[in-house]
């Protein structure tokens, strides 16, 4: 079965600067990646990045850059200013639509306990949607 | 109510300009991609042009360098600045709305340019 | 670039009649493919998105099928207003890329 692992990262030098990365493990081919925050996309979430293979990146305030670390993960810095800056309890998510398994969703937030410039390793977080 | 709105088409000697201009309303304008297609009187569809949410732009080869396409989020807009017009340009513009990598969704209705002299 | 080639060009049908309209990509598209209809004087309108998945609001006698390079546009049973031009959209890679369309006629 297709999982996705999502690891958010708060920066040392910058409290509240994020990097989010997420992958995917499946055998399929990614069509889409959609990475929100406040909840699952199209459930009350705000997307921060979609990422599509052939066609580029679009990417919305506070996103400062979205990009493809691998075929199936990327890798999203959250500008660290501004009244929409993120908070460590902060909930984010992302979606892949992967061809031709469908659409997998996991969400992720800094862990509880993690120093600045440290983070959990990035193991697979639960599945909450496959369409 | 989502609703696309062109215009700005006309009447257009070979060689000249014209400015399309296309109001969006019913929704949240910057979130979306924003594309110009075209359709000549009796033919198929045309793709001629997107614009990204930030302004990143894309064009169709045969119009490259003479169109620009435009947005202001602030005002709900969408333009297309075409130069050096060619009778093959004659068509009917439409704006189109795209949630960007999911398709095109919402048309306008159309602003019919003809370029002859 | 990638050509989308939609066959056939034109077909005549009955009221009632099953349709299939099918789109060829050149190349690997996935299923970034969208299906619209277009009445004389109109603008399109979708009524497939991602091959598959039917636009809100459109009925259900309308369906999309297939990946990668064959797709198809099925109307289980022609209405009247059914009889329009159908397009496929590739929306996979620049330039996005139209099919040459298909004209429904009543027979």
């Known amino acids: 079965t297709p999982e996705v692992w999502v690891q958010v990262r708060m920066e040392a030098t910058e409290l509240s600067s994020f990097t989010i990365r997420c992958g995917f493990l499946g055998s399929g081919s990614i069509s889409l990646v959609t990475v929100s925050w406040g909840g699952p996309n199209g459930a009350g979430g705000t997307t921060l990045a979609v990422l599509h293979p052939e066609r580029g990146i679009r990417q919305w305030a506070p996103a400062r850059q979205a990009r493809w670390e691998t075929q199936s993960s990327i890798s999203l810095i959250l500008e660290g200013s501004g009244a929409s800056s993120p908070c460590a309890n902060t909930t984010f998510c992302c979606k892949f639509a992967s061809f031709p398994e469908g659409s997998w969703e996991a969400c992720g937030s800094l862990p509880p306990s993690s120093d600045p410039g440290l983070s959990a390793p990035p193991t697979p977080a639960p599945i909450l949607r496959a369409d | 109510e989502v609703q696309l709105v062109e215009s700005g088409g006309g009447l257009v000697q070979p060689g000249g300009s014209l400015r399309l201009s296309c109001a969006a309303s019913?929704?949240?304008?910057?979130?979306?991609?924003m594309h110009w297609v075209r359709q000549v009187p009796g033919k198929g569809l045309e793709w001629v042009s997107d614009i990204g949410n930030s302004g990143e732009t894309y064009y169709l080869g045969s119009v490259k360098g003479r169109f620009t396409i435009s947005r202001e989020n602030a005002k709900n807009s969408l333009y297309l600045q075409m130069n050096s017009l060619r009778a093959g340009d004659t068509a009917v513009y439409y704006c189109?709305?795209?949630?960007f990598g999911y398709g095109m969704d919402v048309w306008g209705q159309g602003t019919t340019v003809t370029v002859s002299s | 670039d990638i050509q989308m080639t939609q066959s056939p060009s034109s077909l005549s049908a009955s009221v009632g009649d099953r349709v299939t309209i099918t789109c060829r990509a050149s190349q690997g598209i996935r299923n970034d493919l969208g299906w619209y209809q277009q009445k004389p004087g109109k603008a399109p309108k979708r009524l497939i998105y991602a091959a598959s998945s039917l636009q809100s609001g459109v009925p259900s006698r309308f369906s999309g099928s297939g990946s990668g390079t064959e797709f198809t546009l099925t109307i289980s049973s022609l209405q009247p207003e059914d009889f329009a031009t159908y397009y496929c959209?590739?929306?996979?890679?620049?330039?996005?890329?139209f099919g040459g369309g298909t004209k429904v006629e009543i027979k």
């Open positions: 959209l590739q929306h996979n890679s620049y330039p996005l890329t």
């Open positions: 189109v709305r795209e949630e």
């Open positions: 019913g929704f949240t304008f910057r979130n979306y991609d």
